[in-house]
């Protein structure tokens, strides 16, 4: 089936927004007023994956850019990256596993678990202006909870 997508922004549980930091990195920081326009708009696509009653597989692309968040091993560590794709072929219903995140809703907060690396989550640091990364711990110092804001297309 044609892939179903929606446009949204994400903020971590400390209300930090996600913005571009160079061509292939996201960082999290507090934004206010007109600066909110800097935050990245994601195109969240609902894809095939190990769907359950609690987890919905999604891919997170940057709206109107041929960039997707993906999870790969770098120096033997699961790592979050922005990967460039051929816009003719993406998004698609059957995304490669590295592009897929399990969207988990708990108490009105969202977690994004890597399908490629179970128990590794899209994470932000407590500190301001730090890269968004893939973290292997939940409930520690790093933040793994997000809220989603819908954006009209």
């Amino acid at each position: 089936a044609p892939v179903r997508s929606l446009n949204c922004t994400l903020r971590d549980s400390q209300q930090k927004s996600l913005v571009m930091s160079g061509p292939y990195e996201l960082k999290a920081l507090h934004l206010q007023g007109q600066d909110m326009e800097q935050q990245v708009v994601f195109s969240m696509s609902f894809v095939q994956g190990e769907e359950s009653n609690d987890k919905i597989p999604v891919a997170l692309g940057l709206k109107e850019k041929n960039l997707y968040l993906s999870c790969v091993l770098k120096d033997d560590k699961p790592t979050l990256q922005l990967e460039s794709v051929d816009p003719k072929n993406y998004p698609k219903k059957k995304m490669e596993k590295r592009f897929v995140f399990n969207k988990i809703e708990i108490n009105n907060k969202l977690e994004f678990e890597s399908a490629q690396f179970p128990n590794w989550y899209i994470s932000t640091s407590q500190a301001e202006n730090m890269p968004v990364f893939l973290g292997g711990t939940k409930g520690g110092q790093d933040i793994t909870d997000f809220t989603m804001q819908f954006v009209s297309s």
Partner: antibody
Framework: EVQLQESGPGLVKPSETLSLTCTVS????????VSWIRQPPGKGLEWIGL???????YYNSPLKSRLTISKDNSKSQVSLKLSSVTAADTAVYYC????????????????WGQGTLVTVSS | DIQMTQSPSSLSASVGDRVTITCQAS??????MNWYQQKPGKAPKLLIS???ILRPGVPSRFSGSGSGTDFTFTISSLQPEDFATYYC?????????FGQGTKLEIK
């Protein structure tokens, strides 16, 4: 060679819990999902739900409140429990391996057990 | 949920006949259509996956076609062992759903 074998009591009383086990060989339950499907006598096939390699489950809505699927990887066994059964739950129950081919064919069931008939009657 | 409408529900044919079964999905399922054969007292056997891919060991007289919402399953020349019930299954999204089945009988 991939094989699946269902086992469990052939007769269950109304309001009790139906419990079945699927024992698999030729593949690892850590790597592949297993679905359950049922077929009432003389009728068509109904997909019940599945358990993935990582242990997450998806239950078909009409049965969700009564259904539990779990597994023991070390024993290569998947279990199905369906509570508060009625005569409408009388069926042949099948377990089947899920293909799990990412980016290609995730959900197709390629190998099936031979099925076990469960009759709900007092 | 995606509904699968399979037709006909039963079909009488002779050895050597060409037989066609159709399945219509209530929404676009791309190529995620599978066809199973079931003989009395036996489990369903996967013949075709992803719309038209013949499973290893399945005779070439079986074929599948279609995409989106409309799919066709064909047996080009019926053999005695082909008399059985055939089911379509959509594997695009959960819950997985089957067609009602087509019982193929000897004329």
């Amino acid at each position: 060679e991939v094989q699946l074998q269902e086992s469990g009591p052939g007769l269950v009383k109304p309001s009790e819990t139906l419990s079945l086990t699927c024992t698999v060989s030729g593949f690892s339950l850590r790597d592949f999902g297993v679905s359950w499907i049922r077929q009432p006598p003389g009728k068509g096939l109904e997909w019940i739900g599945l358990i993935w390699g990582g242990g997450d489950t998806y239950y078909n809505s009409p049965l969700k409140s009564r259904l539990t699927i779990s597994k023991d990887n070390s024993k290569s066994q998947v279990s199905l429990k369906l509570s508060s059964v009625t005569a409408a739950d009388t069926a042949v129950y099948y377990c089947a391996k899920v293909r799990n081919l990412w980016g290609y064919d995730m959900y197709t069931m390629d190998y099936w057990g031979q099925g076990t008939l469960v009759t709900v009657s007092s | 949920d995606i509904q699968m409408t399979q037709s006909p529900s039963s079909l009488s044919a002779s050895v050597g006949d060409r037989v066609t079964i159709t399945c219509q999905a209530s929404q676009d399922i791309d190529m995620d259509m599978n066809w199973y054969q079931q003989k009395p007292g036996k489990a369903p056997k996967l013949l075709i996956s992803l719309g038209n891919i013949l499973r290893p060991g399945v005779p070439s007289r079986f074929s599948g076609s279609g995409s989106g919402t409309d799919f066709t399953f064909t047996i080009s020349s019926l053999q005695p062992e082909d008399f059985a019930t055939y089911y379509c299954l959509q594997s695009d999204s959960f819950p997985l759903t089957f067609g009602q089945g087509t019982k193929l009988e000897i004329k």
